[in-house]
């Protein structure tokens, strides 16, 4: 058993039929010695008396809020949560496996630049009685500070018969140098509690590997005189690290006809302009990627030829 | 190739072309190592990230773009003195910091070159003949060092009398390649920045 936060405890249980469970001793936080009784949740049934209560925790029915009283007055609470281990593996029932970039990916994180700011998100089908708490650090043995905000519900989607909820959190490394060469990864730890079930999820990454620039901005077309060609131009996104001559981007330019069956023409360029043959109903799209370290491409910025 | 590769435009900062070749060569070599050594811990997640230049050179700090020198987190630099001549400075009025930066890059390349050559000598003795260092990568390191053209004592190649542990050598190769790729990214960023300024 260990303390998650004040008056909240996690009991780690090997979860299999007829498992013996864990013996837990609860102590009432009071100077009183006599006349103390214990109850569980809203029940008025007295479970025991005395300053300490010994219980055998085997299943969710044994978890919950234990309260010690004296003469009708509440003295203290202890909330017991269960963390299940099945076949040596901690349960992952609360969050959905996103399977990207690989199986057993519950947390996904992205950064728009090298400032040390990043966003992580996760998915669940659970809508109520759910809380998350997020901690992060750079490295684990001698951790350096990363500050995370509160996790918030950021999107709701319908997937078949199920509703899916996306939660996200923003974190910022306390003292980040955009030009630094990372040798210790960022660690992100999410504590998830659904009713009386506790689970934890972790992710470890280098900022350089989770970079995904915002799409290029101000994508514009300028017709060229006496020609069916247009000059396409765009700019670095505002959120990208500066100076741009140091943090350079490469761009992918794509021309797509009206019909999806038409072959796309696609090419890479380091410049922020290109000349394009713009046919009626075609569209031009541009996306960005770090020029020197190939992490994710941005989403496309698009403009119609008409 | 049908014709000898054309030299880059002489108006261009002379080292940019070489640094782009370096990043491509080390990225290709790392990809090859990850494929060939698929049953060894050779991915970014599996290896320990070591920097053989740590406390010996200060490339990141010495090559910091001016715009980032106001960022306190970037300024934990170590005082290091380097020789300050070099042909990448080609007829430009360069600051002391730029010379320091380029000489730090040169020292990095020299240290990696020695490590890679020593390692290659060991890998050549491996009866499995599983992996060797790409000669193109070694040549590109050499070309960039020549373009930087700093005078510096030659470091003798490390020789070892004991029987090499090929498993450890291959893991060390992965560690070195990952670290060198990260440094090659920094070098490319620096050359691009200097070319623009």
């Amino acid at each position: 058993i260990w303390e998650l936060k004040k008056d909240v405890y996690v009991v780690e249980l090997d979860w299999y039929p007829d498992a013996p469970g864990e013996m837990v001793v609860l102590t009432c936080d009071t100077p009183e010695e006599d006349g103390i009784t214990w109850t569980l949740d809203q029940s008025s049934e007295v479970l025991g008396s005395g300053k300490t209560l010994t219980i055998q925790v085997k299943e969710f029915g044994d978890a919950g809020q234990y309260t010690c009283h004296k003469g009708g007055e509440v003295l203290s609470h202890s909330l017991l949560l269960l963390h299940k281990k099945e076949d040596g593996i901690w349960s992952t029932d609360i969050l959905k496996d996103q399977k990207e970039p690989k199986n057993k990916t519950f947390l996904r994180c992205e950064a728009k630049n090298y400032s040390g700011r990043f966003t992580c998100w996760w998915l669940t089908t659970i809508s109520t009685d759910l809380t998350f708490s997020v901690k992060s650090s750079r490295g684990s043995s001698d951790p350096q500070g990363v500050t995370c905000g509160a996790a918030t519900l950021s999107a709701e989607r319908v997937r078949g018969d199920n509703k899916e909820y996306e939660y996200s959190v923003e974190c910022q490394e306390d003292s980040a140098c955009p030009a630094a060469e990372e040798s210790l990864p960022i660690e992100v730890m999410v504590d998830a509690v659904h009713k009386l079930k506790y689970e934890n999820y972790t992710s470890s990454f280098f900022i350089r590997d989770i970079i995904k620039p915002d799409p290029p901005k101000n994508l514009q077309l300028k017709p060229l005189k006496n020609s069916r060609q247009v000059e396409v131009s765009w700019e670095y996104p505002d959120t990208w690290s500066t100076p741009h001559s140091y943090f350079s981007l490469t761009f992918c330019v794509q021309v797509q006809g009206k019909s999806k069956r038409e072959k796309k023409d696609r090419v890479f360029t380091d410049k922020t302009s290109a000349t394009v043959i713009c046919r009626k109903n075609a569209s031009i799209s541009v996306r960005a990627q770090d020029r020197y370290y190939s992490s994710s491409w941005s989403e496309w910025a698009s403009v119609p030829c008409s | 190739r049908n014709l000898p590769v054309a030299t880059p435009d002489p108006g261009m900062f002379p080292c940019l072309h070489h640094s782009q070749n370096l990043l491509r060569a080390v990225s290709n070599m790392l990809q090859k190592a990850r494929q060939t050594l698929e049953f060894y811990p050779c991915t970014s997640e599996e290896i320990d990230h070591e920097d053989i230049t740590k406390d010996k050179t200060s490339t990141v700090e010495a090559c910091l773009p001016l715009e980032l020198t106001k960022n306190e987190s970037c300024l934990n630099s170590r005082e290091t003195s380097f020789i300050t001549n070099g042909s990448c400075l080609a007829s430009r009025k360069t600051s002391f910091m730029m010379a320091l930066c380029l000489s730090s890059i040169y020292e990095d390349l020299k240290m990696y070159q020695v490590e890679f050559k020593t390692m290659n000598a060991k890998l050549l003795m491996d009866p499995k003949r599983q992996i060797f260092l790409d000669q193109n990568m070694l040549a590109v390191i050499d070309e960039l060092m020549q373009a930087l053209n700093f005078n510096s004592e030659t470091v003798p190649q490390k020789s070892s009398l004991e029987e090499p542990d090929f498993y450890k050598t291959k893991i060390k190769l992965c560690i070195l390649l990952h670290a060198f790729r990260i440094r090659a990214v920094t070098i490319d960023r620096v050359m691009s920045y200097l070319n623009a300024s």
Partner: nanobody, 124 residues
Framework: EVQLVESGGGLVQAGGSLRLSCAAS????????MGWFRQTPGKGREFVAA????????DYANSVKGRFTISRDNAKNTAYLQMNNLKPEDTAVYYC?????????????????WGQGTQVTVSS
């Protein structure tokens, strides 16, 4: 393996036009970005223009923008450079090059295959 042969060079007066052709052998022509470079004595090879595999996206050196047009015909395995309003400073040997990296405007060193070049002379 791709073999490239340029043609169409020659002597022309300032203000005149020329059309260079680059014929490629090999079935994979449409997989290569095609570029034109030029070289004057004692100078490095200078980028002129490049065109994407599908022929719809191109890039030009500032010095030729609005005067030169690059195009390609994948059915004929040929790339073209239409040069209008030629100036004496356009005098050079023009090379056609092929690049599998699918990059429009990288340096000459990134092109895998080169033609032998065709001389263009613009007299004033």
């Amino acid at each position: 393996e791709v073999q490239l042969v340029e043609s169409g060079g020659g002597l022309v007066q300032a203000g005149g036009s020329l059309r260079l052709s680059c014929a490629a052998s090999g079935r994979t022509f449409s997989a290569y970005v095609m570029g034109w470079f030029r070289q004057t004595p004692g100078k490095g090879r200078e980028f002129v223009a490049a065109i994407s595999t599908g022929g719809q996206i191109s890039d030009y050196a500032n010095s030729v923008k609005g005067r030169f047009t690059i195009s390609r015909d994948n059915a004929k395995n040929t790339a073209y450079l239409q040069m209008n309003n030629l100036k004496p400073e356009d005098t050079a040997v023009y090379y056609c090059a092929a690049n599998r990296e699918n990059f429009l405007n990288r340096g000459a060193g990134d092109y895998e295959y080169w033609g032998q070049g065709t001389q263009v002379t613009v007299s004033s």
